[in-house]
Amino acid sequence: MRRGPRSLRGRDAPAPTPCVPAECFDLLVRHCVACGLLRTPRPKPAGASSPAPRTALQPQESVGAGAGEAALPLPGLL
């Protein structure tokens, strides 16, 4: 399984996913998984650099770069 081409779209607002509101789109395997109970971010560990800056886009475009945007650490839903 492979994701589609990735574009760098800066800090665009996240586009809607093909998933229902209680689900998230897992980019590794390209399908929706339940995530409603697992959305709470953990505090960013001290000393860690900021996560790779990216913005959620349409699945076909996958994920681009958005400088300075913080990612939310999430339990490993897959």
Partner: antibody, heavy 126, light 107 residues
């Protein structure tokens, strides 16, 4: 302390079966996807399998597909790897590892494996 | 399957040296590239995720860069505890794959 403690390795004859276990502690096991990764003596790391946090979906590397089964018991905080029809080339140190992800909007991005077990050795030999 | 090619396969360096390891992917993987350190008889340890993000607790002398197909792990000033084997790994698609490692040895 977050940790994964493995057991179940050993010496087994070709064609036989073995089950590996990985006991998790220090985190909410049922909220995390889990992997098995192996390393043959003097060789590269090889991804073996992954299982969803709830056990609903599983993926396997081509070399083990149809022979190995990944499973979990969230009530026991334990991950398993059932290895059937073992071959000489399955000889390796096997590691369990926790999936590391970030959420961006409604998208889950995969960032590798952030917690690893100590490894358990499986030797397939007649 | 995405193939990751690491270079060099081994290198000799001294304490205090700046060390650079490269990883090339057979197709674009955006920034979905992670780096691990492994010492003999031990499990791998995550150092860098998403090409350039430092994992919690990892010393700041480790850094990563790159995107697309070409990635670099840099150790700015090699310390005695850094002598180990380093692996890259892609988390862009299943099957997940690893490079075959770069062994950093004492000169």
């Amino acid at each position: 302390e977050v940790q994964l403690v493995q057991s179940g390795g050993g010496v087994v004859q070709p064609g036989r079966s073995l089950r590996l276990s990985c006991a998790a502690s220090g985190f909410t096991f049922g909220s995390y996807g889990m992997h098995w990764v192996r390393q043959a003596p003097g060789k590269c790391l090889e991804w073996v399998a992954v299982i969803w946090y709830d056990g609903s979906n599983k993926y396997y590397g081509d070399s083990v597909k149809g022979r190995f089964t990944i499973s979990r018991d969230n009530s026991k905080n334990t991950l398993y790897l059932q290895m059937n029809s073992l071959r000489d080339e399955d000889t390796a140190v096997y590691y369990c590892a926790r999936r590391f992800t970030h959420l961006r909007g409604q998208y889950i991005e995969d960032y590798g494996m952030d917690v690893w077990g100590q490894g358990t050795t499986v030797t397939v030999s007649s | 399957e995405i193939v990751l090619t690491q270079s060099p396969s081994s290198l000799s360096a001294s304490v205090g040296d700046r060390v650079t390891i490269t990883c090339r992917a057979s197709q674009s993987i955006s920034s979905y590239l992670n780096w691990y350190q492994q010492k003999p008889g031990k499990a791998p340890k995550l150092l860098i995720y998403a090409a350039s993000s430092l994992q919690s607790g990892v010393p700041s002398r480790f850094s990563g860069s790159g995107s697309g197909t070409d990635f670099t792990l840099t150790i700015s000033s090699l310390q005695p505890e850094d002598f180990a084997t380093y692996y890259c790994q892609q988390s862009y698609s299943i099957p997940l794959t690893f490079g075959c490692g770069t062994k950093v040895e004492i000169k």
